[in-house]
């Protein structure tokens, strides 16, 4: 689709003559008829296949034609066409005389032709005007012409339609050949995809307009190339999101346990021994006479109950003193002034004389002890039960009642709750004091990962301890935002637990 444009510049008919030799009276009032058609080696009559146009009277005899952009007498003349421009044409320009005041050229008699010219040849589409001049014996016509494409048409033959756009469906201009040229910052067949910030990670980042980089969940940084470690990860890094790979010297699920705590912090006092183990990352073994988590407390000299036979102990500056009850004497009240005649043995104990009757010894029945069998045996005083087990006296023996997760005579053996694989669907098991905790894979939740998440991963309430749940990129993913004091992918661990 395009327009053949013909600019008439000057017509000269000095003698005011018609083509048949007659004179115009009072002069040749001149208008033009233009016929544009397909190329013909020999111009013939017939339809103007590319279009035709007539002008009103433009002047008398000889005149210059001025450019006029609107109304009647428009110059250049416009011959629009709705087809592919073939590159060749035939053009017939006829000058006619109309005698009357009626300016409608079609009322002109058939014998009023002044002159005609015929141009045949090739013409490429372009903005440059081709100028020409045609003479015959009586007249001269100066003119120029060109072919340009209609709005939105491009290419050598005006056959390529292109309408520029800058909206959500595309951002482009049209090249001279009609192909699309993306506006800066856009790409794609229709220039509808923004070009992200240079270096923005292809998978982990995206953009909604040019030169930005928006990170997908689990990624951060200007170019979205840094993973976000697990919420609560203290001394660790990640290579994929939500991971917590511990730095050297750190351990535990959240890399918050110092594996060299003893060396780094020297927490144990008063010559005690430090070992890198235990719930806090270290344990202090105290020398005799000291106690406390860090062996920071000196024991009372009376703490070992040195006074016998009911003697009462009194602390002194670097020592102690026993106040003996009647009938006893010595540093620890270990000597008695009593004999078997005084029946000193209680609770059915039998008395045996010693040192030719000057002293005695009591033989105690089961469950009683003391130099006078005055003490009931408490087999639990030595705290024989480990790991928080409860000691119970059972007649002549004692038993340990173990906490969940422990077994053995002294509750010294740890039962792994995870040994029986309680976590379904590939869940990861963690042994905790109150039983096992399962960390579930994407798509499952519940205490044992037994609940399949169908749509909204947060609907089942997978986050513990009042944490807030957020769904991830896909409906089966979620992230728990833990409140203060809790960590873990589901906020299931209190801070400080292994």
């Amino acid at each position: 689709s395009g327009i053949f444009q013909l600019r008439l510049q000057e017509f000269v008919n000095q003698r005011g003559m018609l083509a048949n030799g007659q004179s115009c009276e009072p002069g040749c009032r001149t208008f033009f008829r233009i016929c544009l058609k397909h190329f013909q080696a020999t111009f013939s009559e017939g339809p103007c296949t590319f279009g035709n146009v007539s002008t009103p009277v433009l002047g008398t005899n000889s005149f210059v034609v001025r450019d006029k952009n609107s109304g009647s007498g428009r110059n250049p003349l416009q011959l629009p066409f709705n087809f592919t421009w073939p590159g060749t044409f035939s053009l017939n320009i006829q000058a006619w005389h109309t005698p009357g005041d009626d300016l409608r050229p079609e009322t002109s008699p058939g014998n009023s032709l002044i002159s005609q010219i015929i141009i045949q040849g090739s013409l490429a589409v372009g903005k440059i005007w081709r100028t020409d001049e045609q003479n015959d014996t009586l007249t001269r016509l100066s003119y120029s012409y060109r072919v340009i494409c209609s709005d939105n048409y491009y290419g050598e033959s005006c056959s390529r339609l292109c309408k520029k756009r800058d909206d959500h469906f595309g951002h482009y201009e049209c090249q001279p050949d009609g192909s699309l040229s993306c506006l800066p910052g856009w790409t794609g067949k229709y220039c509808d995809q923004p070009i992200c910030l240079s270096g923005c990670h292809e998978q982990n980042g995206y953009c909604s307009k040019p030169d930005e980089c928006i990170c997908r969940p689990g990624w951060q940084g200007r170019l979205c190339n840094e993973c976000i470690p697990h919420n609560g990860c203290r001394h660790g890094t990640c290579s994929i999101p939500w991971q917590c790979a511990c730095d050297e010297g750190w351990g535990g699920l959240f890399c918050d346990q110092d594996l060299n705590y003893c060396t780094h912090h020297s927490p144990c006092k008063n010559g005690s021994t430090c070992s890198n183990s235990g719930p806090k990352g270290y344990t202090c073994t105290c020398l005799p006479g000291y106690t406390g988590e860090h062996c920071e407390l000196g024991l009372s000299k009376c703490a070992s109950n040195p006074c016998r036979n009911g003697g009462s102990c009194k602390d002194q500056e670097n020592s102690y003193h026993c106040l003996c009850p009647p009938g006893y004497y010595g540093q620890h009240c270990e000597h008695s002034t009593l004999t078997c005649a005084d029946s000193p043995c209680f609770n059915g104990g039998s008395c045996r004389e010693r040192n030719q009757g000057s002293s005695y010894a009591c033989e105690c029945p089961p469950n009683f002890t003391g130099s006078n069998c005055e003490k009931k045996v408490d087999r639990c005083t030595s705290n024989p039960c480990a790991n928080g087990g409860q000691c119970q006296n059972r007649g002549p023996s004692r038993t340990c009642r173990c906490r969940p997760g422990f077994t053995g005579t002294h509750c010294e053996l740890h039962i792994s709750d995870c040994a029986r694989s309680p976590c379904a669907h590939g869940g990861t098991c963690h042994d905790l004091e109150n039983g096992p905790v399962c960390t579930c894979p994407a798509g499952f939740s519940g205490r044992r990962c037994e609940v399949r998440i169908t749509h909204d991963a947060c609907a089942s309430g997978p986050c513990f301890n009042g944490a807030t749940c957020y769904t991830g990129l896909s409906p089966n993913n979620f992230v728990c935002n833990c409140p203060y004091g809790f960590v873990g992918s589901r906020c299931e661990f209190p801070v400080g637990l292994p």
Partner: antibody
Framework: QVLLIQSGAEVKKPGASVQVSCKAS????????VIWVRQAPGQGLEYMGW????????NYAQKLQDRVTMTSDTSTTTAYMELRSLRSDDTAVYYC??????????WGQGTLVTVSS | SYELTQPPSVSVSPGQTARITCSGD??????AYWYQQKSGQAPVLVIY???KRPSGIPERFSGSSSGTMATLTISGAQVEDEADYYC???????????FGGGTKLTVL
Amino acid sequence: QVLLIQSGAEVKKPGASVQVSCKASGYTFTNYGVIWVRQAPGQGLEYMGWISAYNGNTNYAQKLQDRVTMTSDTSTTTAYMELRSLRSDDTAVYYCARELGSSFDYWGQGTLVTVSS
Amino acid sequence: SYELTQPPSVSVSPGQTARITCSGDALPKKYAYWYQQKSGQAPVLVIYEDIKRPSGIPERFSGSSSGTMATLTISGAQVEDEADYYCFSTDNSGDHSVFGGGTKLTVL
């Protein structure tokens, strides 16, 4: 081949919300947009809006702007259209279609949403 | 709000040429797209970007655009062409997209 499969028919009460899904297959989901069009019984087509499957950018028809939300999930190659505060004149067949350069060349089968008290 | 205006109905005899018009102020600068919808079916794209025909659409379907008017022409209409036809375009800003009201083509 390119397929757009929409969720099943819905019956809703006035004031409720509806979500229609459109599962795409057979082409690179993020290289195209998705448009939503509705057609009330005996009426013409009404453009509702567009979403870029690549970055989630949206363009909504002015009339529905306050009530419609379009989203897409690249992991499941599914587009969603949610319409809130339903009225009886929202009763229509809702279509999704694939978009490139504002041509809508493949269409879903349509989802009938009926709003009735 | 932007509008595209179509005649409600057009009737032709089989073999005749059917012309369906669509007028809109932005059409000199914006493309027109044409969709065919047969009863109870989803729409089908028959012309895009004013004049282009997707593969699989018969050659009798053609499009043109001049000024504020876009035209869908069906040369030698057939009985199976009986359907509703909708034009689609955007306003000058590109922010508002609309379908025309639709034209029911009857091939008697």
